[in-house]
Interface confidence: low
């Protein structure tokens, strides 16, 4: 029996009421003051939360009664307080005391997963004993109160991939998983309380582990042979093709380069980083006459691969690649870039200048046809060979620059050009000639040698050396000449009198016909008129005013 | 353009087996996979497996599994499909269909078919 | 029943546009090309769009595919008469190490 504190009589056992009781009335317990001697002279109250409602008394035994079904998990205890009195006197035999009826528990309540859904993530081919998550589970009844709340966790789906460990509901490996074989898992777990005795109450729960991936495959090419074409007309940069490996790992894992193991000089490959596809580049010029095809061998590794996945990545997958070059038509090729050939000037209508070549660098060489673009003086025949149309004169043109095109006979739009440089020679047809219009004074009174004039001569004709010109007077004017020639051996020559003193009157003007010949083979001669006026000249000797006096005749005026 | 030529109609009783050929020209009958699909009357098409000739390397639908045996002669170019344990509902028309160079790639060009009747 | 889904018919006059679609899941059209054949009543199944939204040569401009997730989709644009036939869907499925082809729609063109 239990007193109060303050030791004044009250006597009551500790209350329990057993929760989910389905007994219209519980008996709970008795409340007694230890005046009371039975002769009903006392009466028991129930006060506080419940009273009256949840619980009642028997007034004349203090008896107590649950007239409710209580639910622990509702509420565990109830506070009530206590009064006795005399009835026959109608005042309180004990004072006011407070006491409190806790609820028993039963189990009937079972595990919760209150944090569902479970999801976890863990690496394939993790080790076993790897954690991969702890779930748990609520019991809402008393976890003092015997097993009610005492849980053991179990696998009902998930061997023999997982484990559980049965106290603690930390879900481990078990056996090492392949991603690239399934790459998630249902795990149903149970949670029982009781231990595990009979009557447990259990809940389940489901857990989804998806594996993450590892880069534990390398990228595998599925044909030994990939058969890709180029035009040999493609110009480098261009995308021929595309090969692929494939590579069961996802995302980063997947991510793979692709290289070439020969012939990197025309050929390379770069990676699509969308679609993993490796791209074949061309990186030098192709050219069908020189190789057709190319057989090159391509490998492809993971970009990123960890040091200890390394020996899943030992060897790099390889595959070949065979690239046909496509021919493609192309124009004719001259054998020269340019040409330059010699004619010399006045060769007759038809001389060979010379003769060009172009073939057609295709398989199907196809014949030529050239042609001179907009010349009148040369023409070109089918097989390359240039022939003059007209006589040349160096003088009028020294060089000639053609363009001349070859054309592919099957195919017209297959033309080509090149530049022709024609150079004509020098061929000594001209004489030379005085350099300018010689008009020569001499006074009447002259004495013998006396220089009337210094001449010079010119030639149109080019020399190789110097040109180099011989003066002579005519055979008539060397016999009864009055007049000297002297060869300054320079190609001027001076006039000089061969006689003293002339008469106006008699003969005023003399006309002297000067040879000059040139140094060419052969020599050529022309004759040259050079006119010498007399003059009535001054005291000194001078032609001036003779000179003055033709210029104003020439200009229409008479003089006396 | 490429073709494919099936044999032709075959009654099986059931429990027998069948054997149908497709003979594959104007390609490089070794660089492609064939695939073989038939269509049971008024149904959709299935798929049975996938042979490469060059290999004879063979991928089977798990439903033909154990009764069907893909073969390839490359000197005739020339594809076979053998069903045996025949039954009822293996009367279908038998297309054979060229594949491409990887397993997952589509078929480009179909046989005419061959229509295989089981009945007692 | 087919891995991949079609609706079993499709309706439209001519001049209108259709959409045929196809659903599947990771393992096959999440993660490889779709491909769509025509059949035409009595004939061999054609090649129709490959790889997604790729057209062979013949295959009129009309035609186009699409894919988005798991799901793929044939639009048929200016309806005509000829187009009345079964279309498929037809795709590799990883986990199954094999092709899967969807259970056919077939298309009718009224009027």
């Known amino acids: 029996d239990y007193k109060d504190d303050d030791d004044k009589g009250w006597v009551w056992n500790q209350f329990f009421v057993p929760e989910e009781m389905n007994t219209t009335s519980h008996h709970v317990g008795r409340l007694r003051s230890d005046l009371d001697n039975g002769n009903n002279s006392f009466q028991y109250k129930l006060l506080g939360a419940g009273a009256g409602s949840i619980f009642v008394i028997d007034e004349r035994t203090g008896d107590i009664y649950a007239i409710q079904k209580l639910d622990r998990e509702e509420r565990s205890l109830y506070t009530l307080r206590a009064q006795v009195i005399d009835s026959t006197t109608g005042r309180a035999v004990e004072p006011e005391s407070e006491f409190v009826i806790r609820v028993s528990d039963i189990n009937d309540n079972e595990p919760k997963f209150l944090d569902e859904p479970y999801e976890a993530i863990v690496p394939e081919m993790s080790p076993e004993g790897t954690l991969v998550i702890q779930v748990t589970a609520t019991d809402a009844d008393d976890p003092a109160s015997g097993n009610n709340a005492r849980l053991l966790y179990s696998l009902l789906q998930g061997q023999p991939y997982f484990s559980i460990e049965p106290t603690t509901g930390v879900i481990r490996i078990s056996s090492k998983m392949d991603r690239e074989l399934q790459d998630e898992y249902w795990v149903i777990i149970q949670a029982k309380d009781m231990i595990g005795l009979p009557g447990a109450l259990s809940g389940t729960t489901s857990v989804l582990i998806k594996l993450s991936d590892v880069n534990d495959n390398k990228p595998i090419f599925k044909e030994r042979l990939y058969r890709l074409t180029v035009s040999e007309s493609a110009p480098t940069g261009t995308s021929i093709g595309r090969i692929m490996a494939y590579d069961n790992d996802i995302g980063e894992n997947a991510e793979m380069d692709y290289s070439i193991e020969d012939d990197s000089q025309t050929f390379d490959i770069i990676t699509n980083n969308e679609t993993q596809e490796g791209i074949v580049i061309l990186k030098k010029k192709v050219d069908f006459e020189h190789q057709n095809h190319y057989l090159i061998r391509a490998n492809v590794k993971n970009r990123h691969v960890a040091e200890h996945l390394m020996e899943y990545h030992v060897e790099a997958s390889t595959t070949f690649v065979r690239v046909q070059v496509e021919d493609e038509d192309e124009p004719p090729v001259f054998l020269l870039p340019y040409y330059l050939f010699e004619i010399l000037e006045e060769s007759p209508h038809g001389s060979f200048v010379g003769m060009v070549s172009a073939t057609d660098p295709d398989q199907r060489k196809s014949p030529i046809r050239y042609s001179i673009t907009r010349s009148k003086v040369f023409s070109i025949d089918d097989n390359g060979t240039i022939i003059t149309t007209n006589p040349l004169d160096r003088e009028i043109s020294a060089w000639y620059n053609l363009s001349i095109t070859a054309t592919e006979k099957y195919n017209v739009q297959q033309i080509s050009a090149v530049p022709v440089y024609v150079q004509v020679l020098n061929i000594n047809d001209h004489a030379p000639e005085f350099s300018e219009y010689y008009d020569s004074y001499v006074c009447e009174n002259a004495g013998s040698g006396q220089v009337i004039q210094t001449i010079s001569a010119v030639d149109r004709d080019e020399s190789v050396e110097d040109h180099h010109f011989y003066f002579n007077l005519s055979v008539e004017d060397t016999k009864n000449s009055s007049f000297i020639i002297i060869d300054n051996e320079d190609n001027t020559a001076v006039i000089l009198t061969n006689r003293t003193g002339f008469s106006l009157q008699e003969e005023p003007v003399f006309y002297i016909s000067v040879l000059i010949a040139d140094n060419g083979i052969p020599s050529l001669t022309s004759t040259n008129t050079l006119t010498i006026h007399i003059c009535d000249c001054d005291d000194y000797g001078s032609t001036q005013t003779c000179r003055d006096k033709d210029l104003l005749l020439s200009m229409g005026f008479r003089t006396e | 353009q490429v073709q494919l030529v099936q044999s032709g109609a075959e009654v099986k009783k059931p429990g027998a087996s069948v054997k149908v050929s497709c003979k594959a020209s104007?390609?490089?009958?070794?660089?492609?996979?064939m695939s073989w699909v038939r269509q049971a009357p008024g149904q959709g098409l299935e798929w049975m497996g996938i042979i490469h000739p060059s290999g004879g390397d063979t991928t089977y639908a798990q439903k033909f599994q154990g009764r069907v045996t893909m073969t390839g002669d490359t000197s005739t170019s020339t594809v076979y499909m053998e069903l045996s344990s025949l039954r009822s509902e293996d009367t279908a028309v038998y297309y054979c269909?060229?594949?491409?160079?990887?397993?997952?790639?589509?078929?480009?060009?179909w046989g005419q078919g061959t229509l295989v009747t089981v009945s007692s | 029943h087919s891995v991949l889904t079609q609706s079993p018919s499709a309706s439209g006059t001519p001049g209108q546009r259709v959409t045929i679609s196809c659903s599947g899941s990771?393992?096959?059209?999440?993660?490889?090309?779709v491909n769509w054949y025509q059949q035409l009543p009595g004939t061999a199944p054609k090649l129709l769009i490959y790889t997604n939204n790729q057209r062979p040569s013949g295959v009129p401009d009309r035609f186009s595919g699409s894919k988005s997730g798991t799901s793929a989709s044939l639009a048929i644009s200016g309806l005509q008469s000829e187009d009345e036939a079964d279309y498929y869907c037809?795709?590799?499925?990883?986990?199954?190490?094999?092709?899967?082809f969807g259970g056919g729609t077939k298309l009718t063109v009224l009027g």
């Open positions: 990771r393992s096959n059209i999440g993660s490889n090309f």
């Open positions: 269909a060229r594949g491409g160079i990887k397993l997952w790639l589509h078929f480009d060009y």
């Open positions: 037809a795709v590799w499925d990883d986990s199954l190490n094999g092709w899967v």
């Open positions: 104007r390609y490089t009958f070794t660089s492609y996979y």
